[in-house]
């Protein structure tokens, strides 16, 4: 029995609903009474949702899943997952048994956009060319882990003396703190770019130091 799922991962934003598509080709004369459908976590075989004996057996996964009952008879075994969480990320197997068996796995990739970075400077006053300063770029509540890039006002990448830390909160979302240590020139702009690799979303922050005072656009 051929079971079809998308090859590419399904990308879902945290808090939204996702549809994990799965389909099979019913033979002529097929009735739902013959169908055994199981959605399970691929890595653990933990039951997510099932359909058996012509009846939806319900969600075994935090009551956040649903089938599309009106479409099952046409071979649509897709699963709706509500209020997606970081912990939902992974592979889900769609297992169909009629007379024959078939299964396929679909990947769920969870994502959350990063906030616009906030920039802080230490020390933040009485700065002169030649002083060493620490610039911190902070961006919050994104997923998965971010890629962080620094550059100067001319667009030249700054890779030395950068320390980036990412901490997950209870929901699994990451707060990113990236610290750049730099020796000040006469004046300059320092930009931080926080990229979400799944969403291909960039969040920018910059600080411009022009002698006195400093500006934070």
């Amino acid at each position: 029995l051929e079971v079809q799922v998308p090859e590419d991962p399904v990308v879902a934003l945290v808090g939204t609903d996702a549809t994990l598509c799965c389909s099979f080709s019913p033979e002529p004369g097929f009735s739902l009474a013959q169908l055994n459908l199981i959605w399970q976590l691929t890595d653990t075989k933990q039951l997510v949702h099932s359909f058996a004996e012509g009846q939806d057996q319900g969600s075994a996964y935090a009551n956040r899943t649903a089938l599309f009952p009106d479409l099952l008879a046409q071979g649509n075994a897709s699963l709706r997952l509500q209020r997606v969480r970081v912990a939902d990320e992974g592979s889900f197997t769609c297992f169909v048994s009629i007379r024959d068996f078939g299964s396929a796995a679909v990947s769920l990739q969870v994502a959350a956009p990063y906030s616009k970075p906030s920039m802080t400077l230490e020390p933040n006053k009485d700065l002169r060319p030649g002083d060493t300063v620490t610039i911190t770029c902070s961006s919050y509540r994104g997923y998965p882990e971010a890629e962080v890039f620094w550059q100067d006002g001319q667009g030249v990448p700054l890779t030395g003396n950068v320390t980036t830390s990412q901490m997950a909160n209870e929901q699994g979302l990451f707060d990113v703190h990236s610290v750049l240590r730099v020796v000040l020139g006469a004046n300059g702009t320092y930009s931080c770019l926080v990229r979400n690799p799944v969403l291909q979303q960039d969040a920018h922050g910059s600080v411009t130091i022009t002698g006195q005072p400093m500006t934070f656009p």
């Epitope: 058996a52 057996q57 297992f95 007379r99 068996f101």
Partner: antibody, heavy 118, light 109 residues
Framework: EVQLLESGGGLVQPGGSLRLSCAAS????????MSWVRQAPGKGLEWVSG????????YYADSVKGRFTISRDNSKNTLYLQMNSLRAEDTAVYYC???????????WGQGTTVTVSS | QSVLTQPPSASGTPGQRVTISCSGS????????VNWYQQLPGTAPKLLIS??QRPSGVPDRFSGSKSGTSASLAITGLQSEDEADYYC???????????FGGGTKLTVL
């Protein structure tokens, strides 16, 4: 030809340890879940433990939990069962079995005998 | 006591039809594949039927069916070489374990 070959059984005293191995051949070992099933003399089949294809998920029967450890080495196509604190009631023939995507243990080894006795 | 319930014994004469039942629950047979194994004396178990599917090499005298939380194995045209122990088995979602029936000893009279 798809084959599973168990080894490592023998006579051991109560409280002792033993490590069983199951060498797989003729299929892509790293793609399959695997299980250990045992059969005490004159008794029925009893599932002991199972492990996912990557080794990240493991399951155990209540009767062996905390005493037995299942593991695998996909580079060597080998499944293991480390048995500690053995008891007389662990005496059995131990079979390894391939566990496919459709929840079928479809291929079994010939078994290795474990005897726990003083 | 086994999670899946099978009769301890069954018998028939050559050529007869014999059925063996296996009763479980919604967390195993009710939604998971039910497997039937044949174990000839002194040998390892051999997969016979999964739900109603026969692996290649298994004679079509053997058939399986499943309804609700019960399953049955039927053997038609019974032969002396069918004398063996037969086990049903299924994955159980509540126990996170494989569960077996206690086994049915089939005697060919």
């Amino acid at each position: 030809e798809v084959q599973l070959l168990e080894s490592g059984g023998g006579l051991v005293q109560p409280g002792g340890s033993l490590r069983l191995s199951c060498a797989a051949s003729g299929f892509t070992f790293s793609s399959y879940w695997m299980s250990w099933v045992r059969q005490a003399p004159g008794k029925g089949l009893e599932w002991v433990s199972g492990i996912s294809s990557s080794g990240s998920a493991t399951y155990y029967a209540d009767s062996v939990k905390g005493r037995f450890t299942i593991s695998r080495d996909n580079s060597k196509n080998t499944l293991y069962l480390q048995m500690n604190s053995l008891r007389a009631e662990d005496t059995a023939v131990y079979y390894c079995a391939r566990w496919n995507d459709y929840d079928i243990m479809d291929v079994w080894g010939q078994g290795t005998t474990v005897t726990v006795s003083s | 006591q086994s999670v899946l319930t099978q009769p301890p014994s069954a018998s028939g004469t050559p050529g007869q039809r014999v059925t063996i039942s296996c009763s479980g629950s919604s967390s195993n047979i009710g939604r998971r594949t039910v497997n039937w194994y044949q174990q000839l004396p002194g040998t390892a178990p051999k997969l016979l039927i999964s739900n109603s599917q026969r692996p290649s090499g298994v004679p079509d005298r053997f058939s399986g069916s499943k309804s609700g939380t019960s399953a049955s194995l039927a053997i038609t045209g019974l032969q002396s070489e069918d004398e063996a122990d037969y086990y049903c088995a299924s994955w159980d979602d509540s126990l996170n374990a494989w569960v077996f029936g206690g086994g049915t000893k089939l005697t060919v009279l």
